[in-house]
Interface confidence: medium
């Protein structure tokens, strides 16, 4: 008899098979302790071991932790399944600038096309918005308030991160407003935050906050260990790292064992009143890159590159803080003044924050 019509539903008396009425055929009976990978297994290879929740069976038959999408800027694209990891992607309105296994190490807001440019390709979870000139020959220079408005996402066209070595690229970057980052330990041991994507898919049990082995006497590697969110200051005291939890701040550098977290104003804002390792008051400023031209792009995955307009055409749209003062240039990376000469020649792509140096020259900030 054919297998899907077994005599008396006994599967020819074969004890290693059973008859499944739903599919009307004989199915292989998985040994005790193993789970079927499909409704009606046909052979021993259709049976598997069962992993813990939030773990999946990888290609080497190892139970491996699924990545987590718990960071604010990530959403779950596909769930954690028995044989595949959960996959995370940047939440709507953001794109991935630094990928990680089954996730994204660094998400950025989609750029808003500046005045005189229109959306050629909308931003996705993987790619930034691609802009193109609205129409040849037209160059509105901040003629209407609409052209000088702050983008809805609160971002400015962003610069490409400076290249980093393969050994540090995924671990050394984290998203805007992302979770805590752990710094390089003694400038050598690069560690990963407990929830950040792991290259092997398993959560790190050693967050790198203390030596993994007991400290040998006289070892220079041993140090006082402070509480989380505290750092060891120059006087050897555990001091609280500043918090970047205010809506207008983003983390610039993480709280490390020997240095405080530093905060800066979020994209689209500038520091009006400085504070130690942070900014006491951020004020918005508009984007007036009115006459930008599209520069051909070599990298398929990265985003549009803009060139600043010729000398003398920079629109006059500098903001004034609420009290009427000119915004203070409180740190080398937060000056409002841009030297037209410098900006004329430097193409500014859109995948990482642009830092403006005290000399006025844009600096590519790796974040």
């Amino acid at each position: 008899f054919p297998q899907d019509r077994p005599f008396e539903d006994t599967c020819h008396g074969n004890p290693s098979h059973y008859y499944d009425k739903a599919v009307r055929r004989c199915c292989y009976r998985c040994p005790m302790g193993l789970f079927p990978t499909q409704q009606c297994p046909q052979r021993p290879t259709d049976c598997r071991k069962q992993c813990e929740p939030d773990y999946y069976l990888d290609e080497a038959d190892r139970c491996t932790a699924c990545v987590t999408c718990s960071r604010d800027d990530l959403v779950e694209k596909t769930p954690c399944a028995w044989n595949s990891s959960r996959v995370c992607e940047c939440r709507p309105g953001m794109f991935c600038s630094t990928s990680a296994v089954n996730s994204c190490a660094r998400c950025f807001f989609h750029s808003v096309c500046p005045a005189g440019m229109i959306v050629k390709f909308p931003g996705t979870a993987q790619k930034n918005t691609v802009c193109e000139p609205a129409s040849p020959g037209v160059s509105p220079a901040c003629a209407s308030p609409e052209n000088c408005k702050e983008p809805s996402s609160g971002t400015i066209p962003q610069a490409k991160p400076t290249p980093v070595s393969p050994a540090t690229s995924s671990a050394s970057t984290m998203p805007v407003r992302g979770g805590t980052r752990l710094a390089q330990e003694a400038a050598s041991k690069l560690t990963r935050a407990p929830d950040s994507p792991s290259s092997v898919g398993r959560p790190s049990s050693d967050p790198g906050l203390s030596p993994t082995q007991p400290c040998p006497e006289g070892s220079g590697d041993c140090r006082k260990q402070c509480e989380p969110d505290y750092y060891l200051d120059e006087a050897g005291r555990c001091t609280a790292c500043v918090s970047c939890s205010r809506d207008d701040l983003v983390e610039k550098t993480p709280c490390a064992w020997n240095s405080s977290r530093t905060c800066e104003c979020r994209p689209g804002m500038i520091c009006a009143t400085s504070a130690t390792n942070s900014c006491a008051r951020c004020v918005p400023y508009p984007i007036c890159a009115a006459e930008t031209v599209t520069k051909p792009q070599d990298m398929a995955e990265k985003d549009t590159t803009f060139e600043a307009p010729p000398l003398g055409t920079q629109p006059d749209c500098n903001p004034t803080p609420e009290n009427g003062e000119a915004p203070a240039s409180t740190s080398p990376t937060q000056s409002l003044l841009v030297d037209s000469q410098a900006s004329k020649t430097l193409p500014i792509p859109t995948s990482a924050p642009v830092a403006l140096s005290s000399t006025g020259k844009p600096v590519l900030d790796a974040g």
């Epitope: 193993l34 069962q50 929740p53």
Partner: antibody, heavy 119, light 111 residues
Framework: EVQLVQSGAEVKKPGSSVKVSCKAS????????MNWVRQAPGQGLEWMGQ????????NYNGKFQGRVTLTADKSTSTAYMELSSLRSEDTAVYFC????????????WGQGTLVTVSS | EIVLTQSPATLSLSPGERATLSCRAS??????????MLWYQQKPGQPPKLLIY???NVETGIPARFSGSGSGTDFTLTISSLEPEDFAVYFC?????????FGGGTKVEIK
């Protein structure tokens, strides 16, 4: 009948190691996760980790910071738990327990092995 | 890790009375439509014995007077009518996240 038989009581000195065995019978040893749980005198239960004898895969409780090592010998259907750098607070009864697939419960337990750490 | 808090620590009741034991988790134990909460009974000098799995399923061979309920973070073990052999310590356990954790236990003693 499923049975888990553990090795006898041990007295150890601080800083030393102990290796407890758990011999399984009555089921397909390779196909079930073997868990290890300990219980200090008069205290609650503490999950230490688990091993899948079929391939040696393990999950550990990070609390033990690499002090615990789980192994399994398929040829003798025996699981082992080794705890190193013993201290007095490791004095406890150590249990092995088979984990059910599907609901993750531990349905069969060994009788327990008392490990006393004392100088 | 997920913290399980059992209450009360001790329950003094007489045979025939109803026992209600509580276990609260610090985060949800939901997993694909079920709660990965387990209940065990332990008597002196013995290993724990599985009573309830998946929050409400009674293990084979366990008397019907034992029942489990709850979902998310709040769970209850109920013994409808206490028998003399039910006086023991009861532990809840979560398997939602590694490491698995146990509650501190509730001792049900004879009043």
């Amino acid at each position: 009948e499923v049975q888990l038989v553990q090795s006898g009581a041990e007295v150890k000195k601080p800083g030393s190691s102990v290796k407890v065995s758990c011999k399984a019978s009555g089921y397909a040893f390779s196909s079930y996760w073997m868990n290890w749980v300990r219980q200090a005198p008069g205290q609650g239960l503490e999950w230490m980790g688990q091993i899948y004898p079929g391939d040696g895969d393990t999950n550990y409780n990070g609390k033990f910071q690499g002090r615990v090592t789980l192994t399994a010998d398929k040829s003798t259907s025996t699981a082992y738990m080794e705890l190193s750098s013993l201290r007095s607070e490791d004095t406890a009864v150590y249990f092995c327990a088979r984990r059910i697939n599907g609901n993750f419960a531990m349905d069969y337990w060994g009788q327990g092995t008392l490990v006393t750490v004392s100088s | 890790e997920i913290v399980l808090t059992q209450s009360p620590a001790t329950l003094s009741l007489s045979p025939g009375e109803r026992a209600t034991l509580s276990c609260r988790a610090s985060e949800s134990l939901e997993y694909y439509g079920t709660s990965l909460m387990l209940w065990y009974q332990q008597k002196p000098g013995q290993p724990p014995k599985l009573l309830i799995y998946s929050a409400s399923n009674v293990e084979t061979g366990i008397p019907a007077r034992f029942s489990g309920s709850g979902s998310g973070t709040d769970f209850t073990l109920t013994i409808s009518s206490l028998e003399p052999e039910d006086f023991a310590v009861y532990f809840c356990q979560q398997r939602r996240k590694v490491p698995s954790t146990f509650g501190g236990g509730t001792k049900v003693e004879i009043k």
